[in-house]
Interface confidence: low
């Protein structure tokens, strides 16, 4: 049945799906706070533009009885159940914010006539790439793949003089939602990462990973994994590691590396950490005081989703254009808007662009230092520390294959 959109006559509503299954185990109250803070900002911006309209959010909760695992495994049906709820109530906002699980987003996108925009804080998987009316405000797996391929091919930096074409990927199935889809993309045979590498093997057992660290017959010196330092320590412990091993630890949504008093533990010396450039004003905001560094990005994505809607609403209203049209639904891409924490850029497919940062542990100071940054928007790497104090020989990253000379 046709669902009417509460989206005209000066009243504009945002439907926020509050799902029990979520990409991050974040209390729904915190997400509500983020949305409400976003609404206040949007109302102010619209008022400043002379637009006398009402913007509200409706929070749609699932019953939590059927879909109560808390993670994304049972999210496929939860999203559809919430859409059914909206359909039964015959009420839909101008925009749908949520879900964050790849499974549910993919299924909802598949099973609905999407004549409205969908904004997601998550949906990291490749199956959510290139969706005409979906916008993703947390770095999807595709962006990670493009960085890795770019970095692997780089051979003209003082600290990286070899192109790499091989890798191990550690994936044991217990990963968080973001890590699960990042590693899933690296594992997929039909993916950019796979077809750019000459050799790639997935390590699924702890012992496989541990054995590779000192295996003279290993096929690659590079191991990609996803998680925080504690996750690595649990796996690696204080085991000896061959001197030309490089572990790439993907830990995008974690600001802790940039905190002043953080010292890198010794087991991180063979590790390059890939994370996102930290925000500037987030620590003091009212909605984020109770959030861990990892979860700030998730709540921020909800808040930025509201600000993005406000940005598009303002443009369309100023141009006298209708909000309930396919044009509006397809407009949430290829733009930059003023986010909570500064400008936010979306690519041609509605996926957030960001600055990724590759960190190393300085053997001198035992601090995390920025080795290079990578702009996902232009697919370009910018070296930062031209003379890094690496643990690796000659302060250069080793070749990815032991015994192979310059290429």
């Amino acid at each position: 049945s046709q669902v009417s959109q509460n989206c005209h006559n000066g009243s504009y509503e945002i439907s926020v799906l509050m799902m029990g299954n979520s990409a991050f185990a974040e209390p729904l109250k915190n997400l509500e706070d983020a949305v409400n803070e976003g609404l206040e900002i949007v109302r102010g911006r619209l008022q400043n533009a002379g637009l006398n309209v009402t913007v509200n959010a409706t929070f749609m909760y699932s019953d939590g009885l059927i879909h109560n695992s808390g993670d994304c495994r049972s999210s496929t049906c939860e999203g559809l159940d919430l859409l059914r709820k909206i359909s039964n109530a015959q009420r839909m906002g101008c925009v749908l914010i949520g879900p964050s699980c790849t499974y549910s987003t993919f299924q909802m996108y598949l099973d609905t006539e999407l004549s409205y925009p969908m904004i997601s804080a998550g949906s990291f998987g490749l199956s959510c790439d290139y969706k005409e009316t979906l916008t993703r405000l947390m770095s999807p797996a595709r962006k990670l793949m493009y960085f890795l391929v770019n970095f692997w091919k780089t051979n003209d930096l003082p600290f990286k003089t070899y192109s790499w074409s091989t890798s191990y990927v550690y994936k044991n199935g217990t990963e968080t939602e973001d890590c699960f889809w990042y590693l899933n993309a690296l594992e997929a045979s039909v993916s950019y990462f796979s077809h750019e590498l000459g050799f790639k093997v997935v390590l699924r057992q702890d012992k496989e990973f541990q054995d590779i660290l000192m295996d003279h017959n290993r096929k690659s010196n590079v191991i990609i994994m996803c998680g925080g330092p504690e996750f690595l320590y649990k796996l690696k412990g204080d085991r000896a590691v061959a001197e030309d091993i490089v572990i790439i630890l993907v830990d995008l949504f974690n600001d802790q590396y940039f905190e002043d008093n953080v010292t890198a533990p010794d087991y991180m010396k063979n590790v390059l950490v890939l994370t996102l450039s930290p925000g500037n004003s987030l620590l003091n905001s009212s909605f984020s005081r109770n959030l861990s560094p990892t979860k700030r990005d998730f709540a921020l994505a909800y808040l930025n989703g509201i600000l993005l809607f406000g940005h598009m609403l303002k443009i369309f209203l100023e141009n006298g254009e209708n909000i309930t049209t396919p044009k509006f639904a397809h407009a949430f891409r290829n733009l930059t808007f003023e986010g909570y924490d500064g400008p936010v850029t979306l690519d041609d497919w509605g996926d957030v662009d960001s600055t990724m940062v590759l960190l190393y542990t300085s053997v001198d100071t035992k601090k995390y230092k920025v080795l290079l940054t990578y702009d996902t928007h232009v697919n370009k790497t910018y070296p930062v520390d031209m003379s890094p104090t690496f643990t690796w020989k000659n302060s250069k990253l080793p070749n990815d294959i032991t015994g192979r000379g310059p290429q």
């Epitope: 199956s127 290139y130 074409s165 039909v190 950019y192 796979s194 077809h195 590498l197 000459g198």
Partner: antibody, heavy 119, light 107 residues
Framework: QVQLKQSGPGLVQPSQSLSITCTVS????????VHWVRQSPGKGLEWLGV???????DYNAAFISRLNITKDNSKSQVFFTMNSLHSDDTAIYYC?????????????WGAGTSVTISS | DIQMTQTTSSLSASLGDRVTISCRAS??????LNWYQQKPDGTFKLLVY???RLQSGVPSRFSGSGSGTLYSLTISTLEQEDVATYFC?????????FGGGTRLEIK
Amino acid sequence: QVQLKQSGPGLVQPSQSLSITCTVSGFSLTNYGVHWVRQSPGKGLEWLGVIWSGGRKDYNAAFISRLNITKDNSKSQVFFTMNSLHSDDTAIYYCARHGTYPYWYFALWGAGTSVTISS
Amino acid sequence: DIQMTQTTSSLSASLGDRVTISCRASQDISNYLNWYQQKPDGTFKLLVYYTSRLQSGVPSRFSGSGSGTLYSLTISTLEQEDVATYFCQQGKTLPFSFGGGTRLEIK
């Protein structure tokens, strides 16, 4: 100008091997994968395999035991070898350049090499 | 493996006609559907990729549409040079597979 030129024998004896070379110009094999496809009256178009820019290979499971694809990036050449040929391998064999990620299409095709398996 | 089916193996139409060629996949291929033209001399040319994206240099009279398992290629105004065989191909999963082709001729 971007193109793929194929060279190989027209006639091959049963149980022998088929070797075709695809020489590319206008693009680098370090940036694009090259696929092999064949066309026969009986089976239509069949995707045989691909060698990706990084050197990794994917083969159609139906041909994996007798197919080998290699390349020489510096010479811009891709080499296709199929062993243990029989009469129903008679077909036109094409090399094709991979498209732009993520769409998985064949952007540009060679002119084809007509191969007859007969004694 | 995914099977691609083009039920119409040959088609005859008049110059200026609107012609639609269809293709069915054995499972959902999420728009990863491409169309190729094979001229009588055997040369292949990509026309449309990802269901509806026109390859550079292809005349705008060609267009693609579809979703899920059903896809089509449309020629809005048939011209003499469009005489060829048209193939669909799925790029969703390996092994990639093709339809059997639809031969288009002028009445």
